[in-house]
Interface confidence: medium
């Protein structure tokens, strides 16, 4: 999906007001300093992409973000204010709903969701140039 | 199939309150979403208000301590309490459940006018 057609500054402000304060809970009793942000991106567009990929794509060792809190505030705000998105994610979804798995945090989970506030505090802050 | 019933809407003058419903049927799975839209003439449908599974919700700034919506899950059905109404929250007003796969319902007018 190509997300250059998003309308940001809504998606900023759902961040700001929600989905932020999700990510801290998820993480919460791990130490800010725990993990490196490896994952970085350039601008809006490539940051959400990333973002997607983060948070909907399972990873070895990390199964389960799809059905936490951010993730379905995040796929809200995808659907919503990215033009077309909720109708490539039909398939997914549906998909994701029959292999409905038990929850669980693992340290692979805390580090990508780590990584996830990375990406969106580089979102939030477009004009910055990549370091 | 799920369907989605909005209601309540009407008019009323400056100042007045209104209180929308939307009424959720058929096969409903894991429902984590509810939302309100509007959509006035000539203009592209906004995002209003939304409330999570959690009990968390999202305010567009235009209707922030003017707007409250809430949810009773047992019932399947959304509502939006509209206080201090203004001529610009004439629109036709929308739900919509969950958003993987967006669903609408067929809206409500609600129309501010003295």
């Known amino acids: 999906y190509d997300f250059t057609n998003c309308d940001f500054e809504k998606i900023k402000a759902a961040y700001l007001s929600t989905i932020s304060k999700d990510l801290i809970t998820y993480m919460s009793g791990t130490k800010s300093t725990e993990f490196n942000n490896t994952v970085s991106c350039s601008n809006r567009p490539h940051c959400l992409t990333e973002i997607q990929s983060l948070t909907f794509n399972p990873t070895a060792g990390c199964a389960s973000l799809a059905k936490e809190m951010f993730a379905m505030k995040t796929k809200a705000a995808l659907a919503i204010w990215c033009p077309g998105y909720s109708e490539t994610q039909i398939n997914a979804t549906q998909a994701m709903k029959k292999r409905r798995k038990r929850k669980v945090t693992t340290n692979k989970c805390l580090e990508q969701v780590s990584q996830l506030q990375g990406l969106w505090r580089r979102f939030n802050r477009p004009l910055l140039k990549q370091q | 199939e799920v369907q989605l019933v909005e209601s309540g809407g009407g008019l009323v003058q400056p100042g007045g309150s209104l209180r929308l419903s939307c009424a959720a049927s058929?096969?409903?799975?894991?429902?984590?979403?509810m939302g309100w839209f509007r959509q006035a003439p000539g203009k592209e449908r906004e995002l209003v208000s939304a409330?999570?599974?959690?009990?968390?919700?999202y305010y567009a700034d235009s209707v922030k301590g003017r707007f409250t919506i809430s949810a009773d899950n047992s019932k399947n059905t959304a509502y939006l309490q509209m206080n201090s109404l203004k001529p610009e929250d004439t629109a036709v007003y929308y739900c919509?459940?969950?958003?993987?796969?967006?669903?609408w319902g067929q809206g409500t007018l609600v129309t501010v006018s003295s």
């Open positions: 919509a459940l969950d958003l993987s796969t967006v669903r």
């Open positions: 058929g096969r409903i799975f894991s429902t984590y979403f």
């Open positions: 409330i999570f599974s959690d009990g968390s919700t």
